[in-house]
Amino acid sequence: KEITNALETWGALGQDINLDIPSFQMSDDIDDIKWEKTSDKKKIAQFRKEKETFKEKDTYKLFKNGTLKIKHLKTDDQDIYKVSIYDTKGKNVLEKIFDLKIQERVSKPKISWTCINTTLTCEVMNGTDPELNLYQDGKHLKLSQRVITHKWTTSLSAKFKCTAGNKVSKESSVEPVSCPEKGLD
């Protein structure tokens, strides 16, 4: 049940992320803001009125508005996070669940071609679940995951664009390709 109510949130490996609490505004009535990592049911950060803010480790930072910052994301930070907010009378004001998913950023795609084999290849070396798209003179040709191979039959003079993207990043490369009829590299 918790997962179905979760806010899907994407973070980039090695980068920081802020888990912002939607539709929440800090007020004098708020006494307790507690963040938990649900896989080990561990409290990771807590704000309490007139008490020192608790952080389980330095990679966490809790802002005054309840937002949790996780610094330098690692793969084991991928988890379901829960924030519980209570007022000065102990009432549960708000609960939100965040499903934090982490991806490695995509690298810049590399375009290479051979006029002899009338073949162009676009490849992305790094990144989690990359999506590659190849365009010729602005027209979409192909979609793939890590490698796209495109073959042509006639002479070619065109501008190719290859984009690589995932939930946390997007990179692109553009190459003008010119191949004569008989084709020499």
Partner: antibody, heavy 117, light 112 residues
Framework: EVQLVESGGGLVQPGASLKLSCVAS????????MSWVRQTPGKPMEWIGH????????NYAPSLKNRFTISRDNAKTTLYLQMSNVRSEDSATYYC??????????WGQGTLVTVSS | DVVLTQTPVAQPVTLGDQASISCRSS???????????LEWFLQKPGQSPQLLIY???NRFSGVPDRFIGSGSGSDFTLKISRVEPEDWGVYYC?????????FGAGTKLELK
């Protein structure tokens, strides 16, 4: 696993005092508000009151406020209910409960108090 | 004090059928912070009460999804979509919006 174990109940004479205890384990006691609730057969359950995680604030049902006192010792992970000048209508099963996310999310097994001469 | 009226007092039901319990409050249970602190408990024979639902419709951890809480203002319902043997007992509604917090008198779910 959250565990709450009440003790201190028994037979007591009208007008006497009694102190109930509730020992908590399986969670960080000092992080949670705690409540006392009582149940008498044939009557609706009655919320007695609750105490803040650090003991700095208590709130009671007005009808019980002058005779019942809730306290806690976080070092001993123990919740208390001090009952004074007990009456026959105080005969009930007394439960302690941990709050969060609801007002009584986890309950102990209860301790029976019988007020009779 | 806020009075919670539960109906019916007893609910005879067949295994696998749906059961529905109503809880009406003598005043609105909407708190000034916008939340509604209406909870449902089940007390099985010889046991302590256990939390099923908090804030009208939020299932407590480990509670099966056949338990569905709904309602608003002063009119609330607990539905059990397919009654199972472990569901027998007395169901109580509870309000934590207004001091003092109060319980309904209970609804006994029994075998038809």
């Amino acid at each position: 696993e959250v565990q709450l174990v009440e003790s201190g109940g028994g037979l007591v004479q009208p007008g006497a005092s009694l102190k109930l205890s509730c020992v908590a384990s399986g969670f960080t006691f000092s992080d949670y508000w705690m409540s006392w609730v009582r149940q008498t057969p044939g009557k609706p359950m009655e919320w007695i009151g609750h105490i803040k995680y650090d003991g700095s604030y208590t709130n009671y049902a007005p009808s019980l406020k002058n005779r019942f006192t809730i306290s806690r010792d976080n070092a001993k992970t123990t919740l208390y209910l001090q009952m004074s000048n007990v009456r026959s209508e105080d005969s009930a099963t007394y439960y302690c409960a941990r709050e969060a996310p609801g007002a009584a999310s986890y309950w102990g097994q209860g301790t029976l108090v019988t007020v009779s001469s | 004090d806020v009075v919670l009226t539960q109906t019916p007092v007893a609910q005879p039901v067949t295994l696998g059928d749906q059961a529905s319990i109503s809880c009406r409050s003598s005043q609105s249970l909407v708190h000034s912070n916008g939340n509604t602190y209406l909870e449902w408990f089940l007390q099985k024979p010889g046991q302590s009460p256990q939390l099923l639902i908090y804030k009208v419709s939020n299932r407590f951890s480990g509670v099966p999804d056949r338990f569905i809480g709904s309602g608003s203002g002063s009119d609330f319902t607990l539905k059990i979509s397919r009654v199972e043997p472990e569901d027998w007992g007395v169901y109580y509604c509870f309000q934590g919006t207004h001091d003092p917090y109060t319980f309904g008198a209970g609804t006994k779910l029994e075998l038809k």
